[in-house]
Amino acid sequence: LVITPPGPEFVLNISSTFVLTCSGSAPVMWEQMSQVPWQEAAMNQDGTFSSVLTLTNVTGGDTGEYFCVYNNSLGPELSERKRIYIFVPDPTMGFLPMDSEDLFIFVTDVTETTIPCRVTDPQLEVTLHEKKVDIPLHVPYDHQRGFTGTFEDKTYICKTTIGDREVDSDTYYVYSLQVSSINVSVNAVQTVVRQGESITIRCIVMGNDVVNFQWTYPRMKSGRLVEPVTDYLFGVPSRIGSILHIPTAELSDSGTYTCNVSVSVNDHGDEKAINISVIENGYVRLLETLGDVEIAELHRSRTLRVVFEAYPMPSVLWLKDNRTLGDSGAGELVLSTRNMSETRYVSELILVRVKVSEAGYYTMRAFHEDDEVQLSFKLQVNVPVRVLELSESHPANGEQTIRCRGRGMPQPNVTWSTCRDLKRCPRKLSPTPLGNSSKEESQLETNVTFWEEDQEYEVVSTLRLRHVDQPLSVRCMLQNSMGGDSQEVTVVPHSLPFKV
């Protein structure tokens, strides 16, 4: 950009005419105080562009800065701007008039600021005073800008002398604002809502009293604006909240809601966003389920836990063998459903000191008006093995029969073993396991029955010993996942007159 005449400062006579030309490689224009004055733009023969600004019959009011800029800045190379400053000394005009908002100067922290009192004549001497004190302050003055320095919270005026007349400027008010770092938080009453329900989002600021809230939300795209409510929050100093409320949500209201908070004075801001989902209907979805068969151990407590996601909050029922369960007064059963997050829930059935009678078929139902899920499983109560009976008999055929009866859940396994050296059995000599083999001098028969009312298995195992020629220790051992139990009997030959 090239300005002719080149400046950078001109002092014009009042009522004179002055012509400024700006040229550039693209269309250019003049700006004065953010306004575009009347000017003549042209394209030159050499392919350059120019704009001519003619100032006619100038007055003190034409004093100020003028910028030449590219008309449509289309990139960084066209963002250049050239500045010149014009003075038109006008004895009838003291200080240049100011917009009322420019008389209030807000300062954050201890930063330099400018009191922008300007005169039309660069030769005038200008002084700055506290309004109530006549002594001039030692602050550097720039005729094009004003007094720049660090100012306290006070009222100030500028003074100059035009001829023999002392002229005062308007009063300038300086305010220090305690602008701490903005602490913004955004939360919603619900981040998931059904269409027709309301959306309420609260944006809260801590530590600032002068703030502007600006919301962006999906409805803005269609030009439907929502008026937020801004108000103080009591109890904590400097806490202001802005609430955005949409009474009847639509599916198109799904999306990101952003609250931007800026401090008016220096545009220092922060923003927080939250996502809202508007759904057509509510839902219930299982996240963590249980197996088809769940195991509990007799007399131990067992927690059965189901995790699900739902909106709105569903009702939850637990049933056993199709009968609804409730918290028992005796504390044998505890039911609870609690929130893990806004839409995630965990429902627990706690069986305290499990009894055999608590085995059976269980169902958990989670439901609301829009949806439901259910989960069914069988609860198996494991019972430790007990050997209930170990008896011996002598049938007429000369065999010896030993019968072992026991119970447990899950189904116990039976192991028979013998030991011939009574003195060393069973501590010093391991018993010899017996199998069901025809080669051996024994025969094994095992029957298993499931007792429905007791929810456990009964095992009856019979060992037939074809012939016993010396005393024999016989052990019956029952085992399942809960442990084992065993009993022993000593078998003596028929010929011996006694049994131990």
Partner: antibody, heavy 114, light 101 residues
Framework: AVTLDESGGGLQTPGGTLSLVCKAS????????MGWVRQAPGKGLEWVAG???????AYGPAVKGRATISRDNGQSTVRLQLNNLRAEDTATYYC????????WGHGTEVIVSS | LTQPSSVSANPGETVKITCSGG???YGWYQQKSPGSAPVTVI????KRPSDIPSRFSGSKSGSTGTLTITGVQAEDEAVYYC?????????FGAGTTLTVL
Amino acid sequence: AVTLDESGGGLQTPGGTLSLVCKASGFTFSSYAMGWVRQAPGKGLEWVAGIDTAGGTAYGPAVKGRATISRDNGQSTVRLQLNNLRAEDTATYYCTRSSYIDTWGHGTEVIVSS
Amino acid sequence: LTQPSSVSANPGETVKITCSGGTYNYGWYQQKSPGSAPVTVIYWNDKRPSDIPSRFSGSKSGSTGTLTITGVQAEDEAVYYCGSSDSSGLIFGAGTTLTVL
């Protein structure tokens, strides 16, 4: 239309407890702070108490320690309870909307006298 | 809060009532007669409720709030209270009696 209707005023005995209720309608109650302002006969306005949208509360110096303000968003009501009543609590009590007050109720008269 | 105890004006004139000593946020409340409910004419410094005539305006400069009634009318005769609110609550001025001559 936005309306605020106060109830619960009337003759009260010194040392007793005053319970005022304000029923709001015509706006999204949960989005606004609510409060109470009173005016003694021949006197100016005096702010009594406020409750914000998050449930935070604040009280005027004349009632601090004696007053409790609460709200029920479901019922769109705000309640003021004032204990240990004194003759100087005699006033017209107005229900108000927002901490800065953009709407007033018609008021309910409270007279504390034995 | 400090506000003048009374001001008077002829119909059609512009009236300014100032209030100082507040913090960040001024409101103006009109009460036409003792015992009648106040009406908010300006809140949050310069916001005017939709049912309040446009001749009422508010501004704030520094720590002073100003209520301006441009073209005052007979029905504007009332006591005007200023209030200043923040997160610790609200305080009121003693009231300014506006007399329309």
